[in-house]
């Protein structure tokens, strides 16, 4: 006799208004008496509709929450599993049931903001900027909302960057406990003449950090050939262990690059009689603290002042 189990009931994808953080929820299946004591596990698959691959999780819960790109639709499917303990060693699962979440198509795509860019300066404040949609009326203005886990609800930007009295960006500071988790942004717009398409963005703040450049550079030469360069990590909240550095060394007309995770470097002079010996350095967050990052600006150039030419007394 074939053992059967029903799929979960009332599977749905809900938007609680958190700008892309959605709830997938369901109710337990109708279970025949024989399996009342069995633990049910649910296999949930979900994806944005343009994605090739499904994300799969197994849960004993009746709800699962995750972040999505609300610029695109979402689809999910779920089925019930009975463990082999309950079925005499055979793996039993229900048929799949499906649910989808369609995005709002209010406003044409041309009204949506363009070139959204966000930088988390020195791990201290976030600046996002955008350009207006391709074809919008002159009365169009945009509003930015953001949310991350820890906030009760989505918040609106309180400090807009403006151009011609229009919002073209936002500065956010005091973002407590906001890194190493998804940070959701929605920029929507308003116009009396047409609806404006919303734009959604999601990233993690530690991956878009642009540090300040290193400072207090110093260069010295020992034994006339050993170059010693050192610098200080810039001030601010980024721990020294989180930096990686790129150094450009210039010896007369030749320059070359080097890299290190320390804030000093030793190397040999290329030519004993070189007259010009300078370096400058930039930094970014390293792979131990983030998956990505933005290079700082270059520091000021520092040159060795110990050279004494043939004319020196």
């Amino acid at each position: 006799l074939e053992i059967k189990v029903n799929p979960p009931q009332d599977f749905e994808i809900l938007d609680p208004g958190l700008l892309g953080y959605l709830y997938l929820q369901w109710k337990p299946p109708v279970v025949i008496e024989k399996f009342k004591g069995c633990t049910l596990e649910y296999e949930l698959k979900y994806r944005n509709v343009d994605s090739d691959s499904w994300k799969t999780i197994i849960t004993r819960n009746l709800i699962y929450k995750d972040g999505f790109d609300l610029n695109k639709g979402i689809e999910g499917k779920i089925r019930t599993h009975l463990s082999e303990h309950c079925t005499n060693g055979s793996e039993v699962q229900s048929p799949w049931i499906e649910a989808s979440y369609g995005i709002s198509d209010e406003g044409s795509l041309e009204t949506k903001i363009q070139d959204m860019k966000c930088i988390y300066y020195n791990w201290q404040y976030l600046v996002c900027s955008w350009k207006p949609g391709k074809t919008v009326y002159s009365d169009t203005n945009y509003t930015m909302f953001f949310w991350y886990e820890g906030l009760d609800h989505a918040l609106q930007c309180a400090d807009y960057l403006q151009h011609d009295e229009k919002n073209v960006g936002c500065k956010l500071s005091n973002l407590d406990s906001s890194d190493y988790k998804d940070f959701f942004i929605c920029v929507n717009g308003s116009s009396k003449l047409e609806p404006i398409r919303s734009s959604y963005t999601v990233f993690q703040l530690q991956n878009i950090v642009k540090p300040l450049p290193p400072e207090f550079l110093h260069i010295s030469v020992e034994n006339s050939i050993d170059i010693r360069m050192k610098w200080s990590t810039p001030g601010g909240p980024i721990p020294p262990r989180c930096y990686t550095y790129e150094i450009v060394i210039r010896e007369d007309d030749i320059s070359w690059e080097s890299a290190t995770d320390k804030n000093d470097m030793k190397l040999k002079r290329r030519a004993n009689e070189s007259e010009d010996l300078c370096f400058f350095v930039r930094c970014k967050v390293n792979i131990y603290c983030a998956d990505d990052g933005i290079w700082s600006e270059w520091s000021e150039e520092e040159c060795w002042e110990g050279y004494t030419g043939p004319d020196s007394k």
Epitope: E43, I57, Y64, S83, E84
Partner: antibody
Framework: EVQLLESGGGLVQPGGSLRLSCAAS????????LNWVRQAPGKGLEWVSA????????FYADSVKGRFTISRDNSKNTLYLQMNSLRAEDTAVYYC??????WGAGAFDYWGQGTLVTVSS | DIQMTQSPSTLSASVGDRVTITCRAS??????LAWYQQKPGKAPKLLIY???SLESGVPSRFSGSGSGTEFTLTISSLQPDDFATYYC??????????FGQGTKVEIK
């Protein structure tokens, strides 16, 4: 008496491969989900992979996905972990563990004694 | 992923003491939580499953409580054999199965 006995550990160079085995006895093997859990020297426990009783469903931690493959031979009462493209951070004691009840993972009521995998050049 | 946070990391206690270890989940895991004991060089040993069910053969001085996101392992009267490292583990949702970072119970 339930017993799980791992073997196959050893020293391997980065980029190399190793196959761990876990021989089981004392329970209805095909009925129970099995997992691999590892512990780096001086560190905590890290779940690696799971397989359902029939072997039809497998699950992996992100850190090993695409490099490790879990499998089982229910006729031989043996669980396997094929480890490819090994890295220094895979160095650990690898335990096989039996799920108390559940389809893929759950509470682990029996553990093997562990086998040490060292990835070093 | 569900994060499991144990506290304290280290606990100094004496034989006969009542000892409590806390485990917090980053989201609700109902009662799908297990506690393990591990001694140096040995495999972990299951103590508690489903948050409060005592595994067969485990002394009754061990007990588990809690549901949702807050869980507790209590040793009512610490014995010499209980000095070890204790781990919590969630099995509500996976992959991945996640463990707490461990609590070392040492002699005061």
């Amino acid at each position: 008496e339930v017993q799980l006995l791992e073997s196959g550990g050893g020293l391997v160079q980065p980029g190399g491969s190793l196959r761990l085995s876990c021989a089981a006895s004392g329970f209805t093997f095909s009925r129970d989900a099995l997992n691999w859990v590892r512990q780096a020297p001086g560190k905590g426990l890290e779940w690696v992979s799971a397989i359902s009783g029939s072997g039809g469903s497998t699950f992996y931690a992100d850190s090993v996905k695409g490099r490790f493959t879990i499998s089982r031979d229910n006729s031989k009462n043996t669980l396997y972990l094929q480890m490819n493209s090994l890295r220094a951070e895979d160095t650990a004691v690898y335990y096989c563990a039996k799920v108390r009840y559940g389809w893929g993972a759950g509470a682990f009521d029996y553990w093997g004694q562990g086998t040490l995998v060292t990835v070093s050049s | 992923d569900i994060q499991m946070t144990q506290s304290p990391s280290t606990l100094s206690a004496s034989v006969g003491d009542r000892v409590t270890i806390t485990c917090r989940a980053s989201q609700s895991i109902s009662s799908w939580l297990a506690w393990y004991q591990q001694k140096p060089g040995k495999a972990p040993k299951l103590l508690i499953y489903d948050a409060s069910s005592l595994e067969s053969g485990v002394p009754s001085r061990f007990s588990g409580s809690g549901s949702g996101t807050e869980f507790t392992l209590t040793i009512s009267s610490l014995q010499p054999d209980d000095f070890a490292t204790y781990y919590c583990q969630q099995y509500d949702t996976y992959p991945p199965i996640t463990f707490g970072q461990g609590t070392k119970v040492e002699i005061k």
